[in-house]
């Protein structure tokens, strides 16, 4: 699971340390890359590769860093305007409607289909029916069921492009 | 089932202002950043402010920044979107919406983003 530690978890020490720049907020409102003092005067510049914040805002904190899990790859660091970006590795992915954690792609399609799309890292292989071409639900099939694209090997690795 | 029902929008002229009000059936509510996004005729959706969990700090879009404001009652689990100086470019219908994740810490994306209402309309023109 990505680090569920939030700034408030810190000391207040820890969150604003005496060397960070400072400036003026805007109506209010601190640039993306800073957060706002706590007497609303000063906007402090985030700590590259520890905390963010990626738009306008009047947080008394930066937001921390999120840590790709295991089986995860980043793909980007966090900077002060933008946190992580982590990808599923090769031959698992994490779809939108389950966010929480990378799941192993279907090695094949069952009996009766054929495979028309690749494993990626947002999908998992896509099956079809043969004859009518409509899509299979999803279900993991029985092992003696699954077709292979050949003997023991992955129908198809993942792709981290893209 | 979470439901999101906002509320508010209507026609109005350009520095006028609007409240709108999005109330959540969900009990998760009081503990997740909610967002206010907006989608203007033809343009995709495009993120306007998120809120923290506990009401205290908050993301703008810098096309709204100072002049629309964000808050949220966790106790009557509303959130709410004061527009004020509106712009002929504020026309769209705004959604308010819930992250995918309940341990997002502010989310600003649309992707990020699972459980949306219905949205409601808000024109300005002279």
């Known amino acids: 699971e990505s680090a569920l530690i939030t700034q408030q978890d810190l000391a207040p020490q820890q969150r604003a340390a005496p060397q960070q720049k400072r400036s003026s907020p805007s109506e209010g409102l601190c640039p993306p890359g800073h957060h706002i003092s706590e007497d609303g005067r000063d906007c402090i510049s985030c700590k590259y590769g520890q905390d963010y914040s990626t738009h306008w805002n009047d947080l008394l904190f930066c937001l921390r860093c999120t840590r790709c899990d295991s089986g995860e790859v980043e793909l980007s660091p966090c900077t002060t305007t933008r946190n992580t970006v982590c990808q599923c590795e090769e031959g698992t992915f994490r779809e939108e409607d389950s966010p929480e954690m990378c799941r192993k792609c279907r090695t094949g399609c069952p009996r009766g289909m054929v495979k028309v799309g690749d494993c990626t890292p947002w999908s998992d292989i896509e099956c079809v029916h043969k004859e009518s071409g409509t899509k299979h639900s999803g279900e993991v099939p029985a092992v003696e069921e699954t077709v292979t694209s050949s003997p023991g090997t992955p129908a198809s690795p993942c792709s981290l492009s893209g | 089932e979470v439901q999101l029902l906002e509320s508010g929008g209507g026609e109005v002229q350009p520095g006028g202002s609007l409240r709108l009000s999005c109330a959540a059936s969900?009990?998760?509510?009081?503990?997740?950043?909610v967002g206010w996004f907006r989608q203007a005729p033809g343009k995709e959706r495009e993120f306007v402010s998120a809120?923290?969990?506990?009401?205290?700090?908050?993301y703008y879009a810098e096309s709204v920044k100072g002049r629309f404001t964000i808050s949220k009652d966790n106790a009557k689990r509303t959130l709410y979107l004061q527009m004020s100086s509106l712009r002929a470019e504020d026309t769209a219908v705004y959604y308010c919406?819930?992250?995918?994740?309940?341990?997002?810490?502010?989310?600003?994306?649309?992707?990020?983003?699972?459980?949306w209402g219905q949205g409601t309309l808000v024109t300005v023109k002279p």
């Open positions: 809120i923290r969990w506990e009401g205290v700090g908050a």
């Open positions: 969900v009990s998760t509510f009081g503990t997740s950043p």
């Open positions: 919406a819930l992250p995918r994740r309940g341990d997002a810490e502010l989310p600003s994306t649309v992707k990020e983003y699972g459980y």
